[in-house]
């Protein structure tokens, strides 16, 4: 689609005569008829296949024609066409005399023709005007012409339609040859594809507008190059989505079980020694004078029962003080004022004199103790069982019943079968009295969680169009990571292409 433009510049008819030689009365009131048609070697009458146009009366006899294009007038004359410009044409320009106001051909006498010119040739589309001058015996016509493309048409023949747009179907302007020139931030054949944020991961990221980076399932970060670990993963990382690979010192499916509490949290206070005692567990061994789980509290000095022989302990500002029962004295009521003559030994204890009778010592029968055999032996009072062991009196002896994971006479030895992380696939390890037990995450079984019991959700290749499949271990479901151009939970739908253009 284009326009043949004809610019009339000057017409000379000095004598003011018609083609017949007869003069015009009072002068030749001149208008023009233009006929544009296909190329003819010899221009002959017939249909104006490319179009016709007439002018009003432009002047009398000789005159210059004003350029009216800026004012919306009729010069240059416009001959639009709705086809591919063939590159050749024939042009007939007739000058007529209008005796009255009716310029229709049927209203004019046949001899009203002033002059007629006919040209033909080739003409390429372009902005430049071709100047021409045609002279007959009585008249001269100066004019110029050209062919230009209509709006949105481009190319040598005005055959390429291109309409700039900035919407869902494209983001471009048109080059002079009709090719698309994408707006900044867009690419692709029809400039529909946004150029994502620089560095946005090709597979794991995408965008719906320029300089954006949206992440596909399982990925995160400004450039979608960081995988998302398993939901609930506390102290772990991933190299592909939904993994949870534990950092050193952590265990369990979610890496939330602290295998090295002492190092991670330093809970023990006042110079106490910290020992890890299984998952998320520790024991503080307090320095003398401190107590509490974390040795965070001072110990009242009377708590260690320093007073002997039934003496009672009183806390004081500068320590403690023992109130001794009758017959005893000393800082801890350790000295006796009695002798064997006073029968000081209870519960069948036998008395032995010391220091020439100034002192004595009681030899107690089994199950009794104290300097006067006054106390029944409770071999558990000193709380000899370490690590939470339970002390049991067994007649003259005692026994420690240890918590799982501990052994030894006083439960002082830690037997952690879990220390070497025997449970596979993030299984949780539990120390038992006779070994260990693994609690397996969903999808695994066996004594050490070594058997994969769940059906691999990706095994059936559920993803289409070369999409990448990831298995979500927690739910035994799959996630498809679609390549560019496909959507849907299985990447089964192609993204809609723009409607084809009409050429």
């Amino acid at each position: 689609s284009g326009v043949f433009q004809l610019q009339l510049q000057e017409f000379i008819n000095e004598r003011g005569v018609l083609a017949s030689g007869r003069p015009c009365e009072p002068g030749c009131r001149t208008f023009f008829r233009v006929c544009l048609k296909h190329f003819q070697a010899v221009v002959s009458p017939g249909p104006c296949t490319f179009g016709t146009v007439s002018t009003p009366v432009l002047g009398t006899n000789s005159f210059a024609v004003r350029d009216d294009s800026s004012g919306g007038g009729r010069n240059p004359l416009q001959l639009p066409f709705n086809f591919t410009w063939p590159g050749t044409f024939s042009l007939i320009i007739e000058a007529w005399h209008a005796p009255g106001d009716d310029l229709r051909p049927e209203a004019l006498p046949p001899d009203a023709l002033i002059s007629k010119i006919a040209i033909q040739g080739s003409l390429a589309v372009g902005q430049n005007w071709l100047l021409d001058e045609q002279t007959s015996t009585l008249t001269r016509l100066r004019y110029s012409y050209r062919v230009i493309c209509s709006d949105n048409y481009y190319g040598d023949n005005c055959s390429r339609l291109c309409k700039k747009r900035n919407d869902h179907f494209g983001h471009y302007v048109c080059q002079p040859d009709g090719n698309l020139s994408c707006l900044p931030g867009w690419t692709g054949e029809y400039c529909q594809q946004p150029i994502c944020l620089s560095g946005c991961h090709e597979q794991n990221g995408y965008c719906s507008k320029p300089a954006e980076c949206l992440c596909r399932p399982g990925w995160q970060g400004r450039l979608c190059n960081e995988c998302i670990p398993h939901n609930g993963c506390r102290h772990g990382t991933c190299s592909t989505p939904w993994q949870c690979t534990c950092d050193e010192g952590w265990g369990g499916l979610f890496c939330d079980q602290d295998l090295n509490y002492c190092t991670h949290h330093s809970p023990c206070k006042n110079g106490a020694t910290c020992s890890n005692s299984g998952q998320r567990s520790y024991t503080c061994t307090c320095r003398p004078g401190y107590t509490g789980v974390d040795c965070e509290l001072e110990l009242s000095e009377c708590d260690s029962n320093p007073c002997r022989n039934g003496g009672s302990c009183k806390d004081q500002e500068d320590g403690y003080h023992c109130l001794c029962p009758p017959g005893y004295y000393g800082l801890h009521c350790e000295h006796s004022t009695l002798s064997c003559a006073d029968s000081p030994c209870f519960n069948g204890g036998s008395c032995r004199e010391r220091n020439q009778g100034a002192n004595y010592a009681c030899e107690c029968p089994p199950n009794f103790t104290g300097s006067n055999c006054e106390k029944k032996v409770d071999r558990c009072t000193s709380n000899p069982c370490a690590n939470g062991g339970q002390c049991l009196n067994r007649g003259p002896s005692r026994m420690c019943r240890c918590r799982p994971g501990f052994t030894g006479t006083y439960c002082e030895l830690h037997v952690s079968d879990c220390a070497r992380n025997p449970c596979a696939h993030g299984g949780t390890c539990h120390d038992l009295e006779n070994g260990l037990m693994c609690t397996c995450p969903a999808g695994f079984s066996g004594r050490r969680c070594e058997v994969r019991t769940s059906i691999d959700a990706c095994a059936s290749s559920p993803c289409f169009n070369r999409a990448t499949c990831y298995t979500d271990l927690s739910t035994d479901t799959f996630v498809c990571n679609c390549p560019y151009g496909f959507v849907g939970s299985r990447c089964e739908f192609p993204v809609g292409l723009p409607p084809s253009f009409p050429w």
Epitope: P267, Y282, V293, E296, E298, L299
Partner: antibody, heavy 119, light 108 residues
Framework: QVQLQESGPGLVKPSQTLSLTCTVS??????????WTWIRQHPGKGLEWIGY???????HYNPSLKSRLAISVDTSKNQFSLKMSSVTAADTAVYYC???????????WGQGTMVTVSS | EIVLTQSPGTLSWSPGERATLSCRAS???????LAWYQQKPGQAPRLLIY???SRVTGIPDRFSGSGSGTDFTLTISRLEPEDFALYYC?????????FGQGTKVDIK
């Protein structure tokens, strides 16, 4: 802000075991520096510290009550509990659960639950 | 155990007056590990002061604590109507943790 809520029977018979639970909300019981504590207040009297537990299971009791106490924690439910055996009328009190952080100053308290020991 | 004695048991003041509450320990409290609490009827205690003199965030600056060793003081510079309540001191230096028997601040 962490909130605490005590729950349990308001009436216990003598010689039986008193059982109370404290639920931690708007925060996790798995706080490294927190001591989850039980405190009681006898009617018209002062406050008495019972003992505490950490989320790791470590416990420390008031020596005067130790033989009758068992404090436990359930991190999955965000709760800790108190069991006191062989109760007498002298154990009638308002029982509070409280949180101490770092040192034993109690910055968050439950609203308290009245427990009466009576036949 | 460390016994804390608060005196007097009850004090009567008028709003706007300065109130001074005393807490004496049976043994020296190391690191000034002493706290003060306010308790109103039917409510749980509220922490006011820790470390003998550090005010808890959100507690009005009319409350101040002082003292060391065995003698400690809570001062309310200008009593407001909402300050009339029961006040307890607490030591957290030595096991078992102990509280004073309380001082009641009454309106005169």
């Amino acid at each position: 802000q962490v909130q605490l809520q005590e729950s349990g029977p308001g009436l216990v018979k003598p010689s039986q075991t008193l059982s109370l639970t404290c639920t931690v909300s708007d925060g996790s019981i798995n706080s490294v520096e927190s001591y989850w504590t039980w405190i009681r207040q006898h009617p018209g009297k002062g406050l008495e510290w019972i003992g505490y537990i950490k989320y790791t299971g470590g416990i420390h009791y008031n020596p005067s009550l130790k033989s009758r106490l068992a404090i436990s924690v359930d991190t999955s439910k965000n709760q800790f509990s108190l069991k006191m055996s062989s109760v007498t009328a002298a154990d009638t009190a308002v029982y509070y659960c409280a949180r101490a952080r770092g040192s034993h100053t109690f910055d968050v308290w439950g609203q308290g639950t009245m427990v009466t020991v009576s036949s | 155990e460390i016994v804390l004695t608060q005196s007097p048991g009850t004090l009567s003041w008028s709003p706007g007056e300065r109130a001074t509450l005393s807490c004496r320990a049976s043994q020296s409290i190391s690191s000034n590990y002493l706290a003060w609490y306010q308790q109103k009827p039917g409510q749980a205690p509220r922490l006011l002061i820790y470390g003998a003199s550090s005010r808890v965030t959100g507690i009005p600056d009319r409350f101040s604590g002082s003292g060391s060793g065995t003698d400690f003081t809570l001062t309310i510079s200008r009593l407001e109507p909402e300050d009339f309540a029961l006040y307890y001191c607490q030591q957290y230096s030595r096991s078992p943790i102990t509280f004073g028997q309380g001082t009641k601040v009454d309106i005169k």
